[in-house]
């Protein structure tokens, strides 16, 4: 969490941002909140990016003002216009690109004063893994697949029964470049699995950590997966 305060001149206002991550090719949100004002027409929101000449986005007098917007953000940004009055300056970003990573500044002017806060935005690719029994294999085998990751993640297998065991000798992981030549499909195979056990396939890079679990018994197969973004800190 980054909390910024205003500078000289008018009174300062508190602006708060949260570091976040964007998934390449999907839509993202850059979070920013501020002390609200009672008049929408008195609020100015400016989003800036370090190293970019033009603005990322500007909102003033109750509407967008994109005359100074940098070309790389054209047609890709919006604030939640109906939530500005309650202090939400968060920015919607369409079709996140690798090059969108960097330091952003959320700069606010209201009748109460000015304030700003920086936000670190990471970009990459992350997706939920799915673990299945590979019935085509000669021995009892599990196959963990996740369609989109970047940068290249690490893959680690674990089991409930053999806690702390190292499965690197009995697993094989491959990374296949996707058609857009950035993200990769992750496939990891675990051999010699035993029934009545829960296995976990853990995929992690510096942006996200995802886990796919599978419980194999003689009568059923249960699956569960979850994904967690790393380093979401407020400012």
């Amino acid at each position: 969490l980054i909390i910024g305060f205003g500078i000289s001149g008018r009174h300062s206002i508190t602006v708060t941002t949260v570091a976040s991550a964007g998934n390449i090719g999907e839509d993202g949100i850059l979070s920013c909140t501020f002390e609200p004002d009672i008049k929408l027409s008195d609020i100015v929101i400016q989003w800036l990016k370090e190293g970019v000449l033009g603005l990322v986005h500007e909102f003033k007098e109750g509407k967008d003002e994109l005359s100074e917007q940098d070309e790389m953000f054209r047609g890709r940004t919006a604030v939640f216009a109906d939530q500005v009055i309650v202090g939400n300056a968060s920015l919607r970003l369409k079709n996140v690109q690798l090059t969108d990573a960097g330091t952003y500044k959320c700069y606010i002017i209201t009748s109460k004063g000015k304030g700003n806060a920086n936000l670190e935005y990471k970009t990459g690719a992350f997706s939920m893994p799915e673990v299945n029994v590979d019935y085509n294999a000669s021995s009892e085998t599990l196959r963990c697949e996740a369609p989109r990751w970047f940068p290249q993640p690490t893959v680690v297998w674990a089991s409930q029964v053999d806690q702390g065991a190292n499965f690197s000798e009995v697993s094989n992981t491959s990374f296949e470049l996707n058609s857009e030549n950035v993200t990769m499909k992750v496939v990891s195979v675990l051999y010699n699995v035993t029934i009545n056990n829960t296995y976990s396939c853990m995929i992690e890079n510096d942006i996200a950590k995802a886990t796919g679990d599978i419980k194999v018994t003689e009568s059923e197969i249960k699956r569960r997966s979850h994904l967690q973004l790393l380093n979401s800190k407020a400012s």
């Epitope: 090719g25 839509d27 509407k63 967008d64 919006a78 079709n95």
Partner: antibody, heavy 120, light 107 residues
Framework: QLQLQESGPGLVKPSETLSLTCTVS??????????WGWIRQPPGKGLEWIGN???????YYNPSLKSRVTISVDTSKNQFSLKLSSVTAADTAVYYC????????????WGQGILVTVSS | EIVMTQSPATLSVSPGERATLSCRAS??????LAWYQQKPGQAPRLLIY???TRATGIPARFSGSGSGTEFTLTISSLQSEDFAVYYC?????????FGGGTKVEIK
């Protein structure tokens, strides 16, 4: 409510320049949350996005037409214009102007369209 | 550029019946998709944007769903005024592109 109206010649000779104007009424072209776009539709075919302009004059064109297209704006007249050079019969189409959201980028409303035929 | 493919090309439906139109993108467009209705001799009219949000004044019988590469426009009970051509459009990346259209005709 906001209305758009295309105007210009309905017949253009091959190799010449097609020129159309879109007049906006019921609202200002300087409304900051919108771009102003051109879309065309050859007879009996689908729609093709040509490009857009912001009231400040910044433009974005469809790469397939970029070398031949110019879109300009006249805020004093609440108008924006399309020029398409070196036209051929393949440019025969109904040309529509429309307001385009800055994001989401949907087109709404549209002009009623103007048929431009390229023929000698 | 992203290629949008609509199916079927023609859909024959009786008034009062349900119509389901499909639109597929050649790569993910997230939820950055709009649907338009066009009647002969008229300009297209916006029905849906953001894949599922109805535009102002559009009746509740029109609904949109989907995200990524697969999208659906559903007309729950076709009225006589709904027989027209329907287009999907992606605005995920430039250049914005439209599908080839689905003609909904009276059965």
């Amino acid at each position: 409510q906001l209305q758009l109206q295309e105007s210009g010649p309905g017949l253009v000779k091959p190799s010449e320049t097609l020129s159309l104007t879109c007049t906006v009424s019921g609202g200002s072209i300087k409304s900051g949350s919108y771009y102003w776009g051109w879309i065309r539709q050859p007879p009996g075919k689908g729609l093709e996005w040509i490009g857009n302009i912001y009231y400040s004059g910044s433009t974005y064109y469809n790469p397939s037409l970029k070398s031949r297209v110019t879109i300009s704006v006249d805020t004093s007249k609440n108008q924006f214009s399309l020029k398409l050079s070196s036209v051929t019969a393949a440019d025969t189409a109904v040309y529509y102007c429309a307001r385009e959201g800055s994001y989401p980028n949907q087109f709404d409303p549209w002009g009623q369209g103007i048929l431009v035929t390229v023929s000698s | 550029e992203i290629v949008m493919t609509q199916s079927p090309a023609t859909l024959s439906v009786s008034p009062g019946e349900r119509a389901t139109l499909s639109c597929r993108a050649s790569q993910s467009v997230s939820s950055n998709l709009a649907w338009y209705q066009q009647k002969p001799g008229q300009a297209p009219r916006l029905l849906i944007y953001g894949a599922s949000t109805r535009a102002t004044g559009i009746p509740a019988r029109f609904s949109g769903s989907g995200s990524g590469t697969e999208f659906t426009l559903t007309i729950s009970s076709l009225q006589s005024e709904d027989f027209a051509v329907y287009y999907c459009q992606q605005y995920h990346s430039f250049p914005f592109t439209f599908g080839g259209g689905t003609k909904v005709e009276i059965k």
